[in-house]
């Protein structure tokens, strides 16, 4: 009797442990998306960046979806969102149209239920990239903690996309779930 | 019988609770390393910074190892990595040899099994630090979510190390485990 | 007997699951505070920013307290702290008193038990905001992993507060608990 109960308990506890472990993992969606430079728009105006890698090099995704240039939330929760955007210009790429630049990033959230888009985070700098220097570089980093609902979409807008650094270590954004919503 | 089973269950559940709590803690390695300015290399080229504090002031480490200037992963997992690097120059600290500076940080991952080093994150800016100003300052922050395997090493490379701000609140890097690998 | 034990176990396991879930949630305090621009101090010196929103727009708080301009820790733990501070100036706002600016942020920790204040993180840049350009912008991001004790207070100091960008996506700071203290 007692032995049987112990064995049964161990079995149930074992499956509970598996369940707990599995649910813990499933409760932690994440994504780290790196720029796909084959399709960067030109121009100096603010544009939405739609081409990102999700499964090569450092790029990865789990329990979130990447579709139409947007990172889609599959699971309600509080997430830490971040973005790192690098801009660069070398004189061999031709002359800049203007030396006064506004290099900006906007991390936006779109809700499909209520079709609206809101900026969660922004960062950047105005820069004077003089022709006296052969190389220019500038990076922006933003990060913050946000409540996201299933179906909401995260996207990245930048100014001067033609100046983006196409390296995977330079231009990327991501998210990871920290906790459930009470 | 029933009372005995309840007592036994409470005891087993109690130890399971301890185990769960303990394993949760052990499943969350972290490090916050601050610059050790007594041994900052000179030069303007890119160098690896090998001197960091891990156990004084804000610096701390748990379930990771700091050795030979590198942060070593002891436990597979997905980690959030970050770095904050501050550069500064005061006119009393010597005359700048050039006004055109490339102030950069590179967070690199080295795998010992396959001896190779890869940049996970980079950030920085080209700056024009004129001799007309008595003080110059610039900070870089980078952060991202990465899969790290036991034995892999994280290190920091910077340009112009002689300009680093030696304060613990200025120049640091760190990591904390967010979740297991599926 | 066996059926009764199973039912009892399921009931106990169910409550344990609730307890585990609940304690997990309670173990994860967080805050994301956005600038309250109705009360930004003027001047160019370093000042503590005391007006922040905690319950509107992106601003939120749980298991932490916001009081007298400070974010108060209610629960011991290791927290990831972050801040994003944006500065901007448009020529329509009047001429700058000086073109040479030090745009800085300091994230400080105050312990009430031992009345002392220490800077955990700093970031920023010296900038030359020339009158030749009609608009200037600059953002700072800092983040790091710190041990915080119940009762300790986090506050934000900046230079040139009159240049702060008052948008909720621009100027904010926050924290979330990652793990317990061993």
């Amino acid at each position: 009797g007692s032995q049987h109960i112990r064995a049964e308990k161990a079995m149930v506890d074992g499956s509970w442990l598996d369940l707990a472990k599995r649910s813990k993992l499933e409760a932690q969606p994440f994504a780290h998306l790196t720029i796909n430079a084959t399709d960067i728009p030109s121009g100096s105006h603010k544009v939405s960046l739609s081409s990102w890698y999700h499964d090569r090099g450092w790029a990865k995704i789990s329990n979130m979806t990447f579709s139409n240039g947007k990172l889609i939330v599959n699971q309600d929760g509080f997430y830490y969102l971040y973005a790192n955007i690098c801009f660069r210009h070398h004189e061999t790429s031709g002359d800049l149209a203007t030396e006064y630049l506004q290099l900006m990033v906007y991390v936006t959230k779109t809700s499909i239920k209520i079709p609206s888009s809101h900026t969660l985070m922004k960062g950047g700098s105005t820069k004077y990239w003089s022709g006296n220097s052969e190389f220019h570089f500038y990076s922006i980093n933003v990060g913050g903690f946000f409540k996201l609902r299933s179906g909401e979409e995260i996207s990245i807008e930048v100014s001067n996309p033609s100046l983006l650094d196409p390296d995977q270590d330079a231009t990327y954004f991501g998210a990871f779930k920290v906790r459930d919503i009470d | 019988g029933s009372q005995h089973i309840r007592a036994e269950k409470a005891m087993v559940d109690g130890s399971w609770l301890d185990l769960a709590k303990r394993s949760k803690l052990e499943a969350q390695p972290f490090a916050h390393l601050t610059i050790n300015a007594t041994d900052i290399p000179s030069g303007s080229h890119k160098v690896s910074l090998s001197s960091w504090y891990h156990d004084r002031g804000w610096a701390k480490i748990s379930n990771m190892t700091f050795s030979n200037g590198k942060l070593i992963v002891n436990q597979d997992g997905f980690y959030y990595l970050y770095a904050n690097i501050c550069f500064r120059h005061h006119e009393t600290s010597g005359d700048l040899a050039t006004e055109y500076l490339q102030l950069m940080v590179y967070v690199t991952k080295t795998s010992i099994k396959i001896p190779s080093s890869h940049t996970l994150m980079k950030g920085g800016s080209t700056k024009y630090w004129s001799g007309n100003s008595e003080f110059h300052f610039y900070s870089i922050n980078v952060g991202g979510f990465f899969k790290l395997r036991s034995g892999e090493e994280i290190s920091i490379e910077v340009s112009n190390p002689s300009l680093l701000d030696p304060d613990q609140d200025a120049t640091y890097f760190g990591a904390f485990k967010v979740r297991d690998i599926d | 007997g066996s059926q009764h034990i199973r039912a009892e176990k399921a009931m106990v396991d169910g409550s344990w699951l609730d307890l585990a879930k609940r304690s997990k949630l309670e173990a994860q305090p967080f805050a994301h505070l956005t600038i309250n621009a109705t009360d930004i101090p003027s001047g160019s010196h370093k000042v503590s920013l005391s007006s922040w929103y905690h319950d509107r727009g992106w601003a939120k708080i749980s298991n932490m307290t916001f009081s007298n301009g400070k974010l108060i820790v209610n629960q011991d733990g290791f927290y990831y702290l972050y801040a994003n501070i944006c500065f901007r100036h448009h020529e329509t706002s009047g001429d700058l008193a000086t073109e040479y600016l030090q745009l800085m942020v300091y994230v400080t920790k105050t312990s009430i038990k031992i009345p002392s204040s220490h800077t955990l993180m700093k970031g920023g840049s010296t900038k030359y905001w020339s009158g030749n350009s009609e608009f200037h912008f600059y953002s700072i991001n800092v983040g790091g992993f710190f041990k915080l004790r119940s009762g300790e207070e986090i506050s934000i100091e900046v230079s040139n507060p009159s240049l702060l960008d008052p948008d909720q996506d621009a100027t904010y700071f926050g924290a979330f608990k990652v793990r317990d203290i061993d």
């Epitope: - | 600290s93 010597g94 005359d95 500076l101 | -």
Partner: antibody
Framework: EVQLLESGGGLVQPGGSLRLSCAAS????????MSWVRQAPGKGLEWVSG????????YYADSVKGRFTISRDNSKNTLYLQMNSLRAEDTAVYYC???????????????WGQGTLVTVSS | EIVLTQSPGTLSLSPGERATLSCRAS???????LAWYQQKPGQAPRLLIY???SRATGIPDRFSGSGSGTDFTLTISRLEPEDFAVFYC?????????FGQGTKVEIK
Amino acid sequence: EVQLLESGGGLVQPGGSLRLSCAASGFTFSSYAMSWVRQAPGKGLEWVSGITGSGGSTYYADSVKGRFTISRDNSKNTLYLQMNSLRAEDTAVYYCAKDPGTTVIMSWFDPWGQGTLVTVSS
Amino acid sequence: EIVLTQSPGTLSLSPGERATLSCRASQSVRGRYLAWYQQKPGQAPRLLIYGSSSRATGIPDRFSGSGSGTDFTLTISRLEPEDFAVFYCQQYGSSPRTFGQGTKVEIK
């Protein structure tokens, strides 16, 4: 081989002016900061002035500030020192020297020119 | 400004002997940013050591430098006839860059 050749020294009366030149060869002149260092007869060495590779930033010893002007013409690979309101204590051999370019801070001097003598006397 | 004081003023030694020259700073020299030069009569100074201990190109290994903070040393392990000259230390860790007054190493 890096070579630095100073010229323009000579005898000048107190209050007078003189312009020293330093012709550089054997390296990419515009990439390196340059300096002037002087040595009074039988005395030690004194740094006088420095200039960045672009010429955008200049630095001076307090003893010459407001009287001396350092400049460079990168198209001619030449460094200059315009000396005004000369005093007797400015009498020295003036050396032009190259910065190593290995650090972001102006550092040691290597190599040096052979020097040119400036004598300020009535 | 940082004042560098060299000692002794004059050092009288014979070829083959070891020479130890001292350079003391009035305040700590940042990052071991100290150089040593040799100057022979009628010639320009020649760089020997930079960064407190790194030998310049073409400098024989009998010349060595050491020290940090406020105390620095130039050592010539075995004096050769061509080594007799005046030696200057120079700091570049703060502005303005300054020199010591020199140590003359003469033949005994």
